[in-house]
């Protein structure tokens, strides 16, 4: 499956929007750093089938969308930027859904990749729990924003590797 050229542009725009969502100086938030245990092994494509990688990427973007579309994120972050961010993520989800259909078809089911998808979901559960424990403080959002930028960058790298394998 060939992701459209606009897909990689959308990735870059999403990262820029995340960077622009900064509300306070991160220098004051060092003590709030946290290990969210990013599921790195799910983004190492050594033994990945393409369909599995696409399913994991789809879950990653879906969970990012869910995280940033809560009332707490709306209260903490710039709404105009959030709206633009939703549009970019929505487009990426559509692109990946088309790919999943082409790659998986009727032969394989996304349930085959349940463990990988579950690992991504648990990662986002840890992020949500952290925000709750920190009472959605400004610094907690800064830490989460930095974490999502990092995981988003790793997702983009996986997409690049998939493209280079074509």
């Amino acid at each position: 499956c060939d992701l459209p050229q606009t897909h990689s542009l959308g990735n870059r725009r999403a990262l820029i929007l995340l960077a622009q969502m900064r509300r306070i100086s991160p220098f004051s938030c060092l003590k709030d750093r946290h290990d969210f245990e990013f599921p790195q092994e799910e983004f190492d494509d050594k033994q990945f089938q393409k369909a599995q990688a696409i399913s994991v990427l789809h879950e990653m973007i879906q969970q990012t969308f869910n995280l940033f579309s809560t009332k707490d994120s709306s209260a903490a972050l710039d709404e105009t930027l959030l709206d633009e961010f939703y549009i970019e993520l929505d487009q990426q989800l559509n692109d990946l859904e088309s790919c999943v259909m082409q790659e998986v078809g009727v032969i394989e089911s996304p349930l085959m990749y349940e463990d990988s998808i579950l690992a991504v979901r648990k990662y986002f559960q840890r992020i949500t729990l952290y925000l709750t424990e920190k009472k959605y403080s400004s610094c907690a959002w800064e830490v989460v924003r930095a974490e999502i930028m990092r995981s988003f960058s790793l997702s983009i790298n996986l997409q690049k590797r998939l493209k280079s394998k074509e």
């Epitope: 991160p26 060092l30 290990d35």
Partner: antibody, heavy 121, light 107 residues
Framework: EVQLVQSGAEVKKPGESLKISCKGS????????IGWVRQMPGKGLEWMGI????????AYSPSFQGQVTISADKSISTAYLQWSSLKASDTAMYYC??????????????WGQGTLVTVSS | DIQMTQSPSSLSASVGDRVTITCRAS??????LNWYQQKPGKAPKLLIY???SLQSGVPSRFSGSGSGTDFTLTISSLQPEDFATYYC?????????FGQGTKVEIK
């Protein structure tokens, strides 16, 4: 391979200005902060300040606030440390080092080779 | 500012010795404590981060422990290449601060 390459040694006179550099390569320059550390002859390490190259936000140690300026040019993956008027007491080795910011990763995991600044009349 | 105090400031030891260096913070810093090794004329090298995590490529004879205000760097069996100065550093809050250093010399 991650590398931080600093500019060469400098010999200056008191009152002169100076700008030294630290060029990052082998990683995404805007994904890490760059810190500057001073080491005076025979002494320990002193943290001077830090910059987030993604937006050039800076923070300084109170001891160095107003004495130096930290800047960055992300288009060429380079951070800078500058003085507008050097003093003999600025004679030291200056190191840059990368910091993961708010991400859970090792602090100051890569360092530049150091720039020796000598200020003497 | 958070003050970091290392002890001893210097020590003499022999190859094969077990060496312990301590670092105390003036207030609780959780586990945001790093250890560096510096040899003359060279840049510092990260050994331990987040109090007890061994940096990639660092020999397993180096270990770190502690949390809150009291931290320890241990070299289980001192090797000839370990003779150097060691610094602790807190990254709990700005300004980042270093200990004054501990010089490990040959007995």
């Amino acid at each position: 391979e991650v590398q931080l390459v600093q500019s060469g040694a400098e010999v200056k006179k008191p009152g002169e200005s100076l700008k030294i550099s630290c060029k990052g390569s082998g990683y995404s320059f805007t994904s890490y902060w760059i810190g500057w550390v001073r080491q005076m002859p025979g002494k320990g390490l002193e943290w001077m300040g830090i910059i987030d190259p993604s937006d050039s936000d800076t923070a300084y140690s109170p001891s160095f606030q107003g004495q130096v300026t930290i800047s960055a040019d992300k288009s060429i993956s380079t951070a800078y440390l500058q003085w507008s008027s050097l003093k003999a007491s600025d004679t030291a080795m200056y190191y840059c080092a990368r910091h993961p910011g708010l991400n859970w990763a090792p602090d100051f995991d890569y360092w530049g080779q150091g720039t020796l600044v000598t200020v003497s009349s | 500012d958070i003050q970091m105090t290392q002890s001893p400031s210097s020590l003499s030891a022999s190859v094969g010795d077990r060496v312990t260096i301590t670092c105390r913070a003036s207030q609780s810093i959780g586990g945001f404590l790093n250890w560096y090794q510096q040899k003359p004329g060279k840049a510092p090298k990260l050994l331990i981060y987040f109090a007890s995590s061994l940096q990639s490529g660092v020999p397993s004879r180096f270990s770190g422990s502690g949390s809150g205000t009291d931290f320890t760097l241990t070299i289980s069996s001192l090797q000839p290449e370990d003779f150097a100065t060691y610094y602790c550093q807190q990254s709990y809050s700005l300004p980042i601060t270093f200990g004054q250093g501990t010089k490990v010399e040959i007995k």
